[in-house]
Amino acid sequence: IWELKKDVYVVELDWYPDAPGEMVVLTCDTPEEDGITWTLDQSSEVLGSGKTLTIQVKEFGDAGQYTCHKGGEVLSHSLLLLHKKEDGIWSTDILKDQKEPKNKTFLRCEAKNYSGRFTCWWLTTISTDLTFSVKSSRGSSDPQGVTCGAATLSAERVRGDNKEYEYSVECQEDSACPAAEESLPIEVMVDAVHKLKYENYTSSFFIRDIIKPDPPKNLQLKPLKNSRQVEVSWEYPDTWSTPHSYFSLTFCVQVQGKSKREKKDRVFTDKTSATVICRKNASISVRAQDRYYSSSWSEWASVPCS
Amino acid sequence: RNLPVATPDPGMFPCLHHSQNLLRAVSNMLQKARQTLEFYPCTSEEIDHEDITKDKTSTVEACLPLELTKNESCLNSRETSFITNGSCLASRKTSFMMALCLSSIYEDLKMYQVEFKTMNAKLLMDPKRQIFLDQNMLAVIDELMQALNFNSETVPQKSSLEEPDFYKTKIKLCILLHAFRIRAVTIDRVMSYLNAS
């Protein structure tokens, strides 16, 4: 058993049929010595008396808010949460496996630039009685500071019969140099509590590996005389690290119809303009990627051909 | 020491081209190592990230773009700062800083070259003959060093009398390649920045 926060404790349980469970001793936070009784949640049934209560925690029915009273007055609370371990593996029931970039990916993180600011998000099908708390650091043995905000519900989607909820959090490394060469990864730890179930999820990464630039901005087309070709130009996104001659991007320019199966024109360039063949009912799209370290491509920025 | 002329010519000497070749060569070599040594811990997640140039060179600091010198976090470990008379920079100071930057890059290359050659000598003794360093990568290191045009004491190639532990050597190769790739990215950024200046 360990303390998650004041008056909230996590009991770690091996979860299998007829498991013996964990013996837990609760102590009432009071100078009083006698006349103390214990109850669980909203029940008035007295579970025991005395300054300490010893319980055998085996299942969710044994978890919850234990309260010690004296003469109708509440003295203190202890909330017990369960953390299940099945076949030596901690449960991951609360969050959905996003399976990208690999299986067992519960947290996904992205950074728009090298400033040390990043966003992580996760998915769940649970809509109520759910809380998250996020901590982060650079390295684990001698951690350096990363400050994370509160996790917020950022999107709701309908997937078949189920509703899916996306939560996200923004974090900022306290003293980040965009040009630094990372040797220690960023660690992100998310504590998830659903009713009386506790789970924790972690992710470890280098900022350079989670870079995903914003799409290029100000796409403009200039038809070329006596030709089917158009010159398309664009600018670096505002959120990208500066100077751009140091933090350079490379671009992919594509002309395609509405369907992905349609034919296309595609060209890669390090410049902020390119010449492509425009077709009726097609769109010109441009996306960006770090020129020197191949992490993710940005989303597409698009303009219609006509 | 013979410092290069520190005003970038229109093509930033041939260094930009060579640095691009360097990044390509080390990326290819790292990819090859990951594939060939698939049963060794050779991915970014599995290895310890060590920098053999730590405390010996200061490439990131010496080559910091002017625009980032206002960022306190970037100046932590700088012995020499760009900043003179507020944020103004005298051209002589620029020349000096650029020479310092390029000589730091040269020292990095020299250190990695020695390490890679020593390692290759060990790998050539491996009866499994599983992996060797790409001669192209070694050649590209050499070409960039020549383009940088510094003279410095030659570092003797380390020789070891004991029987090499090939497993450890291959893991060290992965560590070196990962670190060298990150440094090659920095070098490429620097050359691109200098070329545009």
Partner: antibody, heavy 118, light 107 residues
Framework: EVQLVQSGAEVKKPGATVKISCKAS????????LHWVRQAPEKGLEWMGW????????EYAPKFQGRVTITADTSTDTGYLELSSLRSEDTAVYYC???????????WGQGTLVTVSS | DIQMTQSPSSVSASVGDRVTITCRAS??????LHWYQQKPGKAPKLLIK???QSISGVPSRFSGSGSGTDFSLTINSLQPEDFATYYC?????????FGGGTKVEIK
């Protein structure tokens, strides 16, 4: 299976015009760009131009501009290359090639040998 | 027009050898470079697109790299069926242009 089948060999006199065909099968003809590339004996490859069968848009290499015409007939899924004012240097194997992407060649015809000789 | 220069023009190698062919563009073409294999009397066959992207059905011993002006095609362990002529082609701008070819011959 995506396939391009070209017409047979041709022998032409200098100054004449040749028209060779390229019949597509195994895909929707207008879904792919169609190119023509030639190869002189013991020489390299030379791109001549492309057509978008969907709308008839064409682009030619400047070297052949004014002498070459590329057409496509969507009713028969066939592309054509017409080269006029033939000279001996035009002796080559002419290939049609197709792709959903405009700028490289995924599927090739078997080639048509055109010999220009007096 | 963008000129593409391949080297060497021919190379003699044995089965099992590692062969590298290079292609240089007269100006920077990013990764807009494709490789083809051609056997005598046959049409060319696409091997690699956009400098390093593999093509389904092409053996993994063929790999490409490069960007800007310098590119290479590597055949990792040469097989008897790999003796052929190899061409690079730029798609950065029209007109599309090919390298002069590299003939891989049996030593």
């Amino acid at each position: 299976e995506v396939q391009l089948v070209q017409s047979g060999a041709e022998v032409k006199k200098p100054g004449a015009t040749v028209k060779i065909s390229c019949k597509a099968s195994g895909y929707t003809f207008s879904d792919y760009y169609l190119h023509w590339v030639r190869q002189a004996p013991e020489k390299g490859l030379e791109w001549m131009g492309w057509i978008d069968p969907e709308n008839g848009d064409t682009e030619y290499a400047p070297k052949f501009q004014g002498r070459v015409t590329i057409t496509a007939d969507t009713s028969t899924d066939t592309g054509y290359l017409e080269l006029s004012s033939l000279r001996s240097e035009d002796t080559a194997v002419y290939y049609c090639a197709a792709n959903k992407e405009l700028r490289y060649f995924d599927v090739w015809g078997q080639g048509t040998l055109v010999t220009v000789s007096s | 027009d963008i000129q593409m220069t391949q080297s060497p023009s021919s190379v003699s190698a044995s089965v099992g050898d590692r062969v590298t062919i290079t292609c240089r563009a007269s100006q920077s073409i990013s990764i807009n470079l494709h490789w083809y294999q051609q056997k005598p009397g046959k049409a060319p066959k696409l091997l690699i697109k956009f400098a390093s992207q593999s093509i389904s059905g092409v053996p993994s011993r063929f790999s490409g790299s490069g960007s800007g002006t310098d590119f290479s095609l590597t055949i990792n362990s040469l097989q008897p069926e790999d003796f052929a002529t190899y061409y690079c082609q730029q798609s950065n701008s029209f007109p599309l242009t090919f390298g002069g070819g590299t003939k891989v011959e049996i030593k």
